[in-house]
């Protein structure tokens, strides 16, 4: 699997949205999760409903919310008031029994707010056409996790 | 085999510039944050400056906020620390790091080169 | 800024020997935590990161736990090459803060 880049601005929200053949993965669940390491587990962050019929239904964990369209083949991810250790590499994935297979591998770069100067360097904004060696770019225009909490608990 | 490669640290006056620059290859540079992190003589390690993978934003340790700017060239694989202002306390092995995005663990580094802040 | 303390600050070993480094945060970290190695003259290595989860090429004698403020690691039967320092790192939340250190020597 290629890695697509989403680009996000820091405090604004992100979607993410990971297409799949609506016939292949008709019935299965899916779900989101973070890689935590380049060989490390995939830790789920949500999933969707866990009656498939009603997948169409967005559910949340904290910040981040799924919802699909089981009939257009279309996953969506919400990132809300995205953080700068919301950046990472991430997988949109089709579960079958304890399986899952891979739907797209996403990339998401948090900007800094350009208001924000706090900790922020220089900005610079990319335009349309960048490219990546196997990274396609998607942009974005656009609740915090406490410190004290897991980043990314599994979820039913 | 992922490699990265440190050059331009040298002796420097109390207020000069130095720019160093970290080549790496290995793996698609495009697509992962990056960073530095120092150890003066004798010391710990101390993280100083990230850059997103598209060069879009970079942070800052509070110490060098200011005098430092981080960047990097995706064409050519290669991550740059303009350090300007340059204190004594600067004095340090400047180690080029691949940064897990979004999570600041440094899961390669480079062998380090060392910057000398002296009269 | 939230503050890593290691324990001890140096530690002398046999081979074969079970050794355990402790850090602790001054404020809850969660599993948000990194340890590394680092040998005289050389860069630093990566041993586990989100507390628990080994890196590539890491052997399974090197183990993380921990959860909050307090985290351990331990080597389960050290070995010669095991003597170096270690370094606690806090993570996932900037700025990224490294503990002091720990120096494991030969007994």
């Known amino acids: 699997h290629n890695t697509t880049v989403f680009q996000g601005v820091a405090g604004q929200s992100l979607q993410v949205s990971c297409p799949y053949d609506s016939m292949k993965h008709w019935g299965r669940r899916k779900a989101w999760c973070r890689q935590l390491g380049e060989k490390g587990p995939c830790q789920r962050v949500v999933s969707t409903h866990n009656l498939w019929l009603l997948s169409f239904l967005r559910r949340w964990n904290g910040s981040t919310a799924i919802t699909d369209d089981t009939l257009g083949g279309t996953l969506t991810i919400t990132l809300r008031n995205l953080q700068p250790h919301d950046a990472g590499l991430y997988q949109c994935q089709s579960l079958h029994g304890s399986e899952a297979d891979t739907l797209r591998k996403v990339l998401v770069e948090v900007l800094a707010d350009p208001l924000d100067h706090r900790d922020a360097g220089d900005l610079w904004f990319p335009g349309e056409s960048e490219s990546f060696e196997d990274a396609h770019v998607e942009h974005s225009i656009s609740r915090s996790l406490l410190e004290g909490e897991i980043p990314f608990p599994p979820t039913s | 085999e992922v490699q990265l490669l440190e050059s331009g640290g040298g002796l420097v006056q109390p207020g000069g510039s130095l720019r160093l620059s970290c080549a790496a290859s290995?793996?698609?540079?495009?697509?992962?944050?990056m960073a530095w992190v120092r150890q003066a003589p004798g010391k710990g390690l101390e993280w100083v400056a990230s850059?997103?993978?598209?060069?879009?934003?970079?942070y800052y340790a509070d110490s060098v906020k200011g005098r430092f700017t981080l960047s990097r060239d995706n064409s050519k694989n290669t991550l740059y620390l303009q350090m300007n202002s340059l204190r004594a306390e600067d004095t340090a092995v400047y180690y080029c790091?691949?940064?897990?995005?979004?999570?600041?663990?440094?899961?390669?580094w480079g062998q380090g080169t060392l910057v000398t802040v002296s009269s | 800024d939230i503050q890593m303390t290691q324990s001890p600050s140096s530690l002398s070993a046999s081979v074969g020997d079970r050794v355990t480094i402790t850090c602790k945060a001054s404020?809850?970290?969660?599993?948000?935590l990194a340890w590394y190695q680092q040998k005289p003259g050389k860069a630093p290595k990566l041993l586990i990161y989100?507390?628990?989860n080994r890196f590539t090429g890491v052997p399974s004698r090197f183990s993380g736990s921990g959860s909050g403020t307090d985290f351990t690691l331990t080597i389960s039967s050290l070995q010669p090459e095991d003597f170096a320092t270690y370094y606690c790192?806090?993570?996932?939340?900037?700025?990224?803060?490294f503990g002091q250190g720990t120096k494991l020597e030969i007994k």
């Open positions: 790091t691949r940064e897990w995005a979004g999570s600041g663990y440094f899961d390669y």
């Open positions: 290995g793996f698609t540079f495009s697509n992962y944050y």
């Open positions: 850059l997103t993978n598209s060069g879009g934003s970079t």
């Open positions: 404020q809850n970290v969660g599993n948000n």
């Open positions: 989100y507390t628990s």
């Open positions: 790192q806090r993570i996932y939340n900037s700025p990224w803060t």
